[in-house]
Amino acid sequence: KELKVTQPEKSVSVAAGDSTVLNCTLTSLLPVGPIKWYRGVGQSRLLIYSFTGEHFPRVTNVSDATKRNNMDFSIRISNVTPEDAGTYYCVKFQKGPSEPDTEIQSGGGTEVYVLAKPS
């Protein structure tokens, strides 16, 4: 099956202090390689979450990524701050035998728009 990374929401709005879910699903787990979430693109992009076991404060996976055939790589960001605003990308990599992993597909991106906390 052809690999497609889908981020169904173009944008989400969230009040500062609240949490938000960023959805991402894959049509295939092949080729073998990790899935990572970034904010921004190019040289300035920031790694937000990696489904490879590291700990990321305030960011958690929504479903159990270790489950066999799990295609859901959505994440939850808690206690959102204005600094979290930006466009988030779910990116699939192909594992390299010795060289670094190769980025092969990305979702279309989901903008996180942070609203002022209601007073």
């Epitope: 173009k10 944008s11 709005s13 693109v41 190019g42 466009t87 980025e103 597909q105 990305s106 279309g108 991106g109 903008e111 728009y113 609203l115």
Partner: antibody, heavy 119, light 108 residues
């Protein structure tokens, strides 16, 4: 049939204001994000601003930030662009554009309205 | 922001000929790219989205290809109504949404 009809263009002096309108029909207006795109004489297309269907999410190009305000009235199926502190470089045809529901490209455009800023 | 560069700036061809327009991005936009046609006095029209999908009602002489940083719009056999200006637009890196500078297809 989708129709977008812009109005409100005209000739103004630098520093003055103008409000553009875009009357939409043929689709469920409140369900779609809407944009303003402009084209200066002899130049290419430049994205100006976008507003989400609910009006909650708004973005501007750096060139107009702090001077232009996008808004919408879903009960009237109308998109607006309030343009303050106009400059000569704002002279352009302003197009209203309906976004696709999946991604941020434009599946329908209006004919545009010409704004001329001249002393 | 992602910069799109279109080439050539002007393409002079005769009706019936094949037109090949190029759009290059300064960083990968995967296949998140659209093409538009703009004729004088008319609203811009969406031709291609997702780099290669034809929009509703667009004749099959228009086709798009490419991914990453290099994209092509091909018009297989130019008709009189195809002489116009063509723009590419990326919707991956946003905001802002960015357009290429345009390619004018004119009658030779």
């Amino acid at each position: 049939d989708v129709q977008l009809v812009e109005s409100g263009g005209g000739v103004v002096r630098p520093g003055e204001s103008l409000r553009l309108s875009c009357a939409a029909s043929g689709f469920t207006f409140s369900s779609y994000d809407m944009n303003w795109v402009r084209q200066a004489p002899g130049e290419g297309l430049e994205w100006v601003s976008l507003i989400s269907g609910s009006g909650e999410i708004i973005y501007y190009a750096d060139s107009v930030k702090g001077r232009f305000t996008i808004s919408r009235d879903n009960s009237k199926n109308t998109l607006y662009l309030q343009m303050n502190s106009l400059r000569a470089e704002d002279t352009a045809v302003y197009y209203c554009a309906k976004e696709n529901n999946r991604y941020r490209f434009f599946d329908y455009w209006g004919l545009g309205t010409l704004v001329t800023v001249s002393s | 922001k992602t910069v799109l560069t279109q080439s050539p700036g002007t393409l002079s061809l005769s009706p019936g000929e094949r037109a090949t327009l190029t759009c290059r991005a300064d960083q990968s936009v995967y296949t998140y790219l659209a093409w538009y046609q703009e004729r004088p006095g008319q609203a811009p029209r969406l031709l291609i989205y997702d780099a290669s999908s034809r929009a509703t009602g667009i004749p099959d002489r228009f086709s798009g290809s490419g991914s990453g940083t290099e994209f092509t719009l091909t018009i297989s056999s130019l008709q009189s109504e195809d002489f116009a200006v063509y723009y590419c637009q990326q919707y991956y890196d946003r905001p802002p949404l960015t357009f290429g500078g345009g390619t004018k297809v004119e009658i030779k």
